[in-house]
Protein backbone atom coordinates (compact mmCIF):
# COMPACT_ATOMS: atom_id res chain seq x y z
CA UNK A 1 0.00 0.00 0.00
CA UNK A 2 1.65 3.19 -1.15
CA UNK A 3 0.37 6.30 0.54
CA UNK A 4 1.43 9.78 -0.50
CA UNK A 5 1.94 12.56 2.02
CA UNK A 6 -1.23 14.05 3.44
CA UNK A 7 -3.55 11.26 2.28
CA UNK A 8 -6.19 10.07 4.72
CA UNK A 9 -6.54 6.33 5.24
CA UNK A 10 -10.25 5.64 5.47
CA UNK A 11 -11.28 3.19 8.15
CA UNK A 12 -14.73 1.72 8.54
CA UNK A 13 -16.67 4.14 10.68
CA UNK A 14 -17.88 2.63 13.92
CA UNK A 15 -15.17 0.01 14.07
CA UNK A 16 -12.18 2.26 13.87
CA UNK A 17 -11.60 5.88 14.80
CA UNK A 18 -9.32 8.58 13.49
CA UNK A 19 -5.77 9.21 14.55
CA UNK A 20 -6.22 12.95 14.58
CA UNK A 21 -7.24 14.74 17.71
CA UNK A 22 -10.34 16.57 16.60
CA UNK A 23 -13.20 14.20 15.89
CA UNK A 24 -14.04 10.53 15.57
CA UNK A 25 -14.56 10.32 11.81
CA UNK A 26 -12.75 7.04 11.28
CA UNK A 27 -9.83 8.63 9.44
CA UNK A 28 -6.17 7.92 10.10
CA UNK A 29 -4.07 10.88 9.08
CA UNK A 30 -0.84 9.95 7.39
CA UNK A 31 1.93 12.54 7.38
CA UNK A 32 4.46 10.52 5.44
CA UNK A 33 4.58 7.74 2.89
CA UNK A 34 4.51 4.23 4.26
CA UNK A 35 7.62 2.11 4.01
CA UNK A 36 5.85 -1.17 4.77
CA UNK A 37 3.03 -3.14 3.25
CA UNK A 38 0.71 -2.76 6.22
CA UNK A 39 -2.87 -2.92 5.02
CA UNK A 40 -5.55 -0.37 5.81
CA UNK A 41 -7.50 -3.19 7.48
CA UNK A 42 -4.53 -4.06 9.71
CA UNK A 43 -4.07 -0.47 10.83
CA UNK A 44 -7.74 -0.22 11.69
CA UNK A 45 -7.90 -3.50 13.59
CA UNK A 46 -8.25 -3.69 17.38
CA UNK A 47 -8.96 0.00 17.78
CA UNK A 48 -12.40 -0.05 19.37
CA UNK A 49 -10.89 1.62 22.44
CA UNK A 50 -10.45 4.74 20.31
CA UNK A 51 -14.20 5.33 20.53
CA UNK A 52 -13.85 6.57 24.10
CA UNK A 53 -10.50 8.36 23.85
CA UNK A 54 -10.06 11.93 22.71
CA UNK A 55 -6.55 13.32 22.54
CA UNK A 56 -5.32 16.83 23.11
CA UNK A 57 -4.69 19.18 20.22
CA UNK A 58 -1.33 18.37 18.59
CA UNK A 59 -1.57 14.75 19.78
CA UNK A 60 -2.46 11.86 17.47
CA UNK A 61 -4.74 9.02 18.51
CA UNK A 62 -4.16 5.35 17.80
CA UNK A 63 -5.51 2.23 19.55
CA UNK A 64 -6.79 4.17 22.53
CA UNK A 65 -3.53 6.01 23.15
CA UNK A 66 -2.30 9.51 22.35
CA UNK A 67 1.01 10.29 20.67
CA UNK A 68 3.03 13.49 20.31
CA UNK A 69 5.92 13.87 17.86
CA UNK A 70 8.57 16.45 18.71
CA UNK A 71 10.08 18.90 16.27
CA UNK A 72 13.12 19.80 18.36
CA UNK A 73 15.96 17.57 19.55
CA UNK A 74 17.01 16.58 23.07
CA UNK A 75 19.05 13.94 24.87
CA UNK A 76 17.21 10.81 25.97
CA UNK A 77 16.97 11.96 29.62
CA UNK A 78 15.75 15.43 28.65
CA UNK A 79 13.18 13.83 26.34
CA UNK A 80 12.13 11.53 29.17
CA UNK A 81 11.55 14.50 31.50
CA UNK A 82 9.75 16.48 28.78
CA UNK A 83 7.18 13.69 28.48
CA UNK A 84 6.87 13.35 32.26
CA UNK A 85 6.13 17.07 32.53
CA UNK A 86 3.17 16.49 30.25
CA UNK A 87 1.99 13.51 32.32
CA UNK A 88 2.96 11.18 29.54
CA UNK A 89 5.96 8.95 28.88
CA UNK A 90 8.43 8.24 26.11
CA UNK A 91 6.97 5.91 23.52
CA UNK A 92 6.50 2.25 24.46
CA UNK A 93 6.00 0.12 21.35
CA UNK A 94 3.85 -2.95 21.88
CA UNK A 95 3.79 -4.53 18.44
CA UNK A 96 4.64 -4.13 14.76
CA UNK A 97 1.30 -2.49 13.98
CA UNK A 98 2.07 0.27 16.46
CA UNK A 99 5.54 0.57 14.94
CA UNK A 100 3.94 0.97 11.52
CA UNK A 101 1.65 3.70 12.82
CA UNK A 102 4.62 5.51 14.33
CA UNK A 103 6.65 5.21 11.16
CA UNK A 104 3.82 6.58 9.05
CA UNK A 105 3.66 9.68 11.22
CA UNK A 106 7.37 10.39 11.43
CA UNK A 107 8.24 13.40 9.33
CA UNK A 108 11.86 12.48 8.68
CA UNK A 109 14.26 9.55 8.33
CA UNK A 110 16.48 10.36 11.32
CA UNK A 111 16.70 8.65 14.70
CA UNK A 112 13.88 9.27 17.19
CA UNK A 113 14.10 8.47 20.90
CA UNK A 114 11.69 5.95 22.40
CA UNK A 115 11.10 4.89 26.01
CA UNK A 116 13.64 2.11 26.11
CA UNK A 117 17.07 2.12 27.73
CA UNK A 118 19.70 -0.31 28.95
CA UNK A 119 19.65 -0.42 32.73
CA UNK A 120 22.91 -1.45 34.34
CA UNK A 121 20.98 -2.56 37.43
CA UNK A 122 19.01 -5.20 35.53
CA UNK A 123 21.62 -5.58 32.77
CA UNK A 124 18.81 -5.62 30.25
CA UNK A 125 16.84 -3.38 27.90
CA UNK A 126 13.85 -2.03 29.82
CA UNK A 127 10.86 0.08 28.80
CA UNK A 128 10.18 3.20 30.88
CA UNK A 129 7.24 1.45 32.56
CA UNK A 130 9.67 -1.14 33.93
CA UNK A 131 8.74 -3.96 31.58
CA UNK A 132 11.44 -5.86 29.66
CA UNK A 133 11.59 -5.78 25.88
CA UNK A 134 10.09 -8.76 24.07
CA UNK A 135 13.02 -10.08 22.06
CA UNK A 136 10.63 -12.20 19.98
CA UNK A 137 9.07 -9.01 18.58
CA UNK A 138 11.95 -6.52 18.57
CA UNK A 139 15.66 -6.77 17.90
CA UNK A 140 17.93 -3.91 18.98
CA UNK A 141 20.85 -3.17 16.70
CA UNK A 142 23.99 -2.07 18.49
CA UNK A 143 25.66 -2.50 21.88
CA UNK A 144 23.77 -3.39 25.05
CA UNK A 145 25.79 -1.48 27.60
CA UNK A 146 25.58 1.27 30.19
CA UNK A 147 24.47 4.66 28.86
CA UNK A 148 22.71 3.05 25.91
CA UNK A 149 19.25 4.27 24.95
CA UNK A 150 16.99 3.19 22.13
CA UNK A 151 16.00 5.16 19.06
CA UNK A 152 13.92 4.10 16.08
CA UNK A 153 14.68 4.67 12.44
CA UNK A 154 12.74 3.19 9.53
CA UNK A 155 10.89 0.71 11.77
CA UNK A 156 14.09 -0.61 13.32
CA UNK A 157 15.38 -0.08 16.88
CA UNK A 158 18.97 1.06 17.39
CA UNK A 159 21.18 1.36 20.46
CA UNK A 160 22.53 4.91 20.74
CA UNK A 161 24.45 6.90 23.34
CA UNK A 162 21.90 8.45 25.70
CA UNK A 163 23.55 11.87 25.50
CA UNK A 164 22.98 12.08 21.74
CA UNK A 165 20.27 14.52 20.72
CA UNK A 166 17.35 13.30 18.64
CA UNK A 167 13.67 14.03 18.24
CA UNK A 168 11.36 11.99 20.46
CA UNK A 169 7.80 10.73 20.87
CA UNK A 170 5.60 11.07 23.96
CA UNK A 171 2.63 8.79 24.65
CA UNK A 172 -0.24 8.61 27.14
Amino acid sequence: LLVSQGVLLKCQKGSCSNATQYEDTGDLKVNNGTRRNISNKDLCASRSADQTVLCQSEWLKYQGKCYWFSNEMKSWSDSYVYCLERKSHLLIIHDQLEMAFIQKNLRQLNYVWIGLNFTSLKMTWTWVDGSPIDSKIFFIKGPAKENSCAAIKESKIFSETCSSVFKWICQY
Epitope: L54, Q56, S57, D78, V81
Partner: antibody, heavy 117, light 110 residues
Framework: SLEESGGDLVQPEGSLTLTCTAS?????????MCWVRQAPGKGLEWIGC????????TYYTSWAKGRFTITKTSSTTVTLQMTGLTAADTATYFC?????????????WGPGTLVTV | AFELTQTPSSVEAAVGGTVTIKCQAS??????LAWYQQKPGQPPKLLIY???TLESGVPSRFKGSGSGTEFTLTISDLECADAATYYC????????????FGGGTEVVVK
Protein backbone atom coordinates in the same frame (compact mmCIF):
# COMPACT_ATOMS: atom_id res chain seq x y z
CA SER B 1 -0.44 20.98 53.72
CA LEU B 2 0.63 24.25 52.09
CA GLU B 3 0.86 27.74 53.54
CA GLU B 4 1.52 31.03 51.77
CA SER B 5 3.30 33.94 53.44
CA GLY B 6 4.66 37.35 52.49
CA GLY B 7 1.40 39.06 51.56
CA ASP B 8 1.55 42.78 52.32
CA LEU B 9 0.53 46.29 51.38
CA VAL B 10 2.89 47.45 48.63
CA GLN B 11 3.27 50.68 46.65
CA PRO B 12 2.56 50.80 42.90
CA GLU B 13 5.58 49.73 40.82
CA GLY B 14 6.89 48.00 43.94
CA SER B 15 8.07 44.42 44.31
CA LEU B 16 7.10 41.58 46.61
CA THR B 17 8.09 37.96 47.14
CA LEU B 18 5.57 35.39 48.34
CA THR B 19 6.61 32.06 49.83
CA CYS B 20 4.77 28.76 49.74
CA THR B 21 5.86 26.33 52.44
CA ALA B 22 4.99 22.64 52.46
CA SER B 23 4.56 20.57 55.57
CA UNK B 24 4.01 16.84 55.63
CA UNK B 25 5.73 16.39 52.27
CA UNK B 26 8.70 17.79 50.36
CA UNK B 27 9.25 18.88 46.79
CA UNK B 28 11.62 16.00 46.14
CA UNK B 29 9.08 14.28 43.91
CA UNK B 30 8.28 15.28 40.37
CA UNK B 31 5.09 17.32 40.18
CA UNK B 32 3.96 20.89 39.68
CA MET B 33 3.80 23.62 42.30
CA CYS B 34 1.59 26.40 41.04
CA TRP B 35 0.41 29.89 41.91
CA VAL B 36 -3.16 31.08 41.42
CA ARG B 37 -4.61 34.44 42.36
CA GLN B 38 -8.07 35.85 42.98
CA ALA B 39 -8.90 39.55 42.94
CA PRO B 40 -11.60 40.62 45.43
CA GLY B 41 -14.98 39.41 44.18
CA LYS B 42 -13.45 37.94 41.00
CA GLY B 43 -12.62 34.51 39.66
CA LEU B 44 -9.52 32.33 39.88
CA GLU B 45 -6.60 33.31 37.68
CA TRP B 46 -3.74 30.91 36.94
CA ILE B 47 -0.30 32.56 37.20
CA GLY B 48 2.24 29.82 36.62
CA CYS B 49 3.84 26.58 37.73
CA UNK B 50 7.25 25.11 38.41
CA UNK B 51 8.06 21.44 37.85
CA UNK B 52 9.79 20.15 40.96
CA UNK B 53 11.70 17.44 39.10
CA UNK B 54 15.26 17.75 37.84
CA UNK B 55 14.37 20.09 34.98
CA UNK B 56 12.87 22.78 37.21
CA UNK B 57 10.87 23.96 34.20
CA THR B 58 8.60 26.95 34.73
CA TYR B 59 5.46 27.87 32.83
CA TYR B 60 3.55 31.15 33.03
CA THR B 61 0.39 32.71 31.76
CA SER B 62 1.12 35.31 29.08
CA TRP B 63 0.61 38.40 31.26
CA ALA B 64 2.91 37.09 34.02
CA LYS B 65 5.96 36.47 31.83
CA GLY B 66 8.83 38.80 32.66
CA ARG B 67 7.12 40.28 35.71
CA PHE B 68 6.51 37.19 37.85
CA THR B 69 9.11 34.51 38.63
CA ILE B 70 8.52 31.17 40.32
CA THR B 71 11.51 29.53 42.03
CA LYS B 72 12.02 26.39 44.09
CA THR B 73 14.18 27.71 46.93
CA SER B 74 14.40 24.57 49.06
CA SER B 75 12.94 21.09 49.37
CA THR B 76 9.89 22.58 51.10
CA THR B 77 9.57 26.12 49.74
CA VAL B 78 8.60 27.72 46.45
CA THR B 79 8.53 31.47 45.94
CA LEU B 80 6.69 33.89 43.66
CA GLN B 81 8.63 37.06 42.95
CA MET B 82 6.50 39.91 41.65
CA THR B 83 7.77 43.18 40.18
CA GLY B 84 6.14 46.27 38.69
CA LEU B 85 3.03 45.77 40.78
CA THR B 86 -0.11 47.75 40.00
CA ALA B 87 -3.56 48.00 41.56
CA ALA B 88 -4.70 45.22 39.21
CA ASP B 89 -2.39 42.83 41.07
CA THR B 90 -4.35 43.28 44.30
CA ALA B 91 -5.57 39.78 45.11
CA THR B 92 -5.38 36.76 47.36
CA TYR B 93 -2.54 34.58 46.13
CA PHE B 94 -2.82 30.81 46.51
CA CYS B 95 -0.20 28.15 46.00
CA UNK B 96 -1.38 24.70 44.95
CA UNK B 97 0.18 21.34 44.28
CA UNK B 98 -0.58 19.18 41.29
CA UNK B 99 -0.64 15.53 42.35
CA UNK B 100 2.00 14.19 40.00
CA UNK B 101 -0.21 11.32 38.85
CA UNK B 102 -1.31 10.76 35.26
CA UNK B 103 -4.23 13.18 35.67
CA UNK B 104 -3.91 16.91 36.13
CA UNK B 105 -5.44 18.20 39.33
CA UNK B 106 -4.61 20.64 42.14
CA UNK B 107 -5.54 18.57 45.17
CA UNK B 108 -3.63 20.52 47.82
CA TRP B 109 -4.13 24.27 48.30
CA GLY B 110 -2.86 26.81 50.78
CA PRO B 111 -5.31 29.18 52.51
CA GLY B 112 -3.97 32.14 50.54
CA THR B 113 -2.15 35.37 51.35
CA LEU B 114 -3.47 38.85 50.55
CA VAL B 115 -1.47 41.30 48.46
CA THR B 116 -2.73 44.89 48.33
CA VAL B 117 -1.21 47.41 45.91
CA ALA C 1 -4.16 31.21 23.53
CA PHE C 2 -5.88 28.32 25.25
CA GLU C 3 -9.02 29.52 27.06
CA LEU C 4 -12.00 28.08 28.92
CA THR C 5 -15.47 29.59 28.69
CA GLN C 6 -17.83 28.72 31.53
CA THR C 7 -21.62 29.16 31.45
CA PRO C 8 -23.77 30.35 33.07
CA SER C 9 -22.08 32.89 35.32
CA SER C 10 -24.82 32.40 37.90
CA VAL C 11 -27.59 29.88 38.46
CA GLU C 12 -30.30 29.52 41.07
CA ALA C 13 -32.03 26.27 42.03
CA ALA C 14 -34.08 24.84 44.86
CA VAL C 15 -32.93 22.31 47.44
CA GLY C 16 -33.27 18.85 45.90
CA GLY C 17 -32.99 20.27 42.40
CA THR C 18 -30.35 19.86 39.72
CA VAL C 19 -27.82 22.33 38.33
CA THR C 20 -25.81 21.97 35.12
CA ILE C 21 -22.67 24.00 34.45
CA LYS C 22 -20.90 23.96 31.10
CA CYS C 23 -17.27 24.56 30.25
CA GLN C 24 -16.01 24.99 26.70
CA ALA C 25 -12.32 24.74 25.78
CA SER C 26 -10.88 26.71 22.87
CA UNK C 27 -9.03 23.58 21.69
CA UNK C 28 -9.28 19.86 22.27
CA UNK C 29 -7.91 18.90 25.69
CA UNK C 30 -9.05 15.27 25.71
CA UNK C 31 -10.23 14.62 29.25
CA UNK C 32 -7.72 16.92 30.95
CA LEU C 33 -10.27 18.98 32.85
CA ALA C 34 -10.96 19.43 36.58
CA TRP C 35 -13.81 21.02 38.52
CA TYR C 36 -13.42 22.95 41.79
CA GLN C 37 -15.82 24.28 44.40
CA GLN C 38 -14.98 27.48 46.27
CA LYS C 39 -16.75 29.06 49.18
CA PRO C 40 -16.08 32.65 50.39
CA GLY C 41 -12.84 33.04 52.33
CA GLN C 42 -11.66 29.52 51.46
CA PRO C 43 -9.32 28.07 48.84
CA PRO C 44 -10.85 26.01 46.04
CA LYS C 45 -11.67 22.37 46.72
CA LEU C 46 -11.11 19.72 44.05
CA LEU C 47 -14.31 17.90 43.06
CA ILE C 48 -13.61 16.14 39.77
CA TYR C 49 -10.53 15.46 37.66
CA UNK C 50 -9.96 13.71 34.35
CA UNK C 51 -13.31 15.25 33.28
CA UNK C 52 -15.35 12.61 35.10
CA THR C 53 -13.42 11.06 38.01
CA LEU C 54 -14.76 11.96 41.43
CA GLU C 55 -12.15 13.06 43.97
CA SER C 56 -12.08 10.94 47.11
CA GLY C 57 -14.66 12.07 49.66
CA VAL C 58 -16.77 14.04 47.18
CA PRO C 59 -20.46 13.00 47.10
CA SER C 60 -21.66 11.14 44.02
CA ARG C 61 -24.26 13.89 43.52
CA PHE C 62 -21.45 15.68 41.65
CA LYS C 63 -20.98 14.33 38.15
CA GLY C 64 -18.53 15.41 35.47
CA SER C 65 -18.84 14.50 31.81
CA GLY C 66 -17.55 15.46 28.39
CA SER C 67 -14.30 15.33 26.47
CA GLY C 68 -12.49 17.24 23.76
CA THR C 69 -13.86 20.77 23.97
CA GLU C 70 -17.24 20.38 25.73
CA PHE C 71 -17.53 19.56 29.43
CA THR C 72 -20.35 19.54 31.97
CA LEU C 73 -20.63 19.51 35.75
CA THR C 74 -24.00 18.31 37.04
CA ILE C 75 -25.00 18.69 40.67
CA SER C 76 -28.11 16.73 41.57
CA ASP C 77 -30.14 16.54 44.81
CA LEU C 78 -28.92 20.04 45.68
CA GLU C 79 -28.16 20.78 49.31
CA CYS C 80 -27.70 24.13 51.01
CA ALA C 81 -24.01 23.28 51.45
CA ASP C 82 -23.61 23.23 47.65
CA ALA C 83 -24.05 27.00 47.50
CA ALA C 84 -20.65 28.11 46.20
CA THR C 85 -18.79 29.20 43.10
CA TYR C 86 -17.65 26.43 40.76
CA TYR C 87 -14.68 26.61 38.40
CA CYS C 88 -13.44 24.42 35.62
CA UNK C 89 -9.72 24.19 34.93
CA UNK C 90 -8.15 22.69 31.85
CA UNK C 91 -4.63 21.80 30.85
CA UNK C 92 -2.97 21.74 27.49
CA UNK C 93 -0.04 19.37 26.99
CA UNK C 94 1.67 21.68 24.51
CA UNK C 95 5.33 22.68 24.44
CA UNK C 96 4.45 25.44 26.91
CA UNK C 97 1.61 24.05 29.07
CA UNK C 98 -0.96 26.34 30.64
CA UNK C 99 -3.64 25.68 33.27
CA UNK C 100 -6.37 28.31 32.80
CA PHE C 101 -9.61 28.47 34.78
CA GLY C 102 -13.08 29.15 33.52
CA GLY C 103 -14.75 32.36 34.67
CA GLY C 104 -16.70 30.62 37.42
CA THR C 105 -20.38 29.87 38.08
CA GLU C 106 -22.10 31.02 41.24
CA VAL C 107 -24.65 28.48 42.44
CA VAL C 108 -27.41 29.88 44.65
CA VAL C 109 -29.52 27.32 46.50
CA LYS C 110 -33.03 28.44 47.47
Amino acid sequence: SLEESGGDLVQPEGSLTLTCTASGFSFSGSYYMCWVRQAPGKGLEWIGCIYTGSSGSTYYTSWAKGRFTITKTSSTTVTLQMTGLTAADTATYFCARDTGTTNWRYNIWGPGTLVTV
Amino acid sequence: AFELTQTPSSVEAAVGGTVTIKCQASQSIGSDLAWYQQKPGQPPKLLIYGASTLESGVPSRFKGSGSGTEFTLTISDLECADAATYYCQGTDRSSAPTWPFGGGTEVVVK
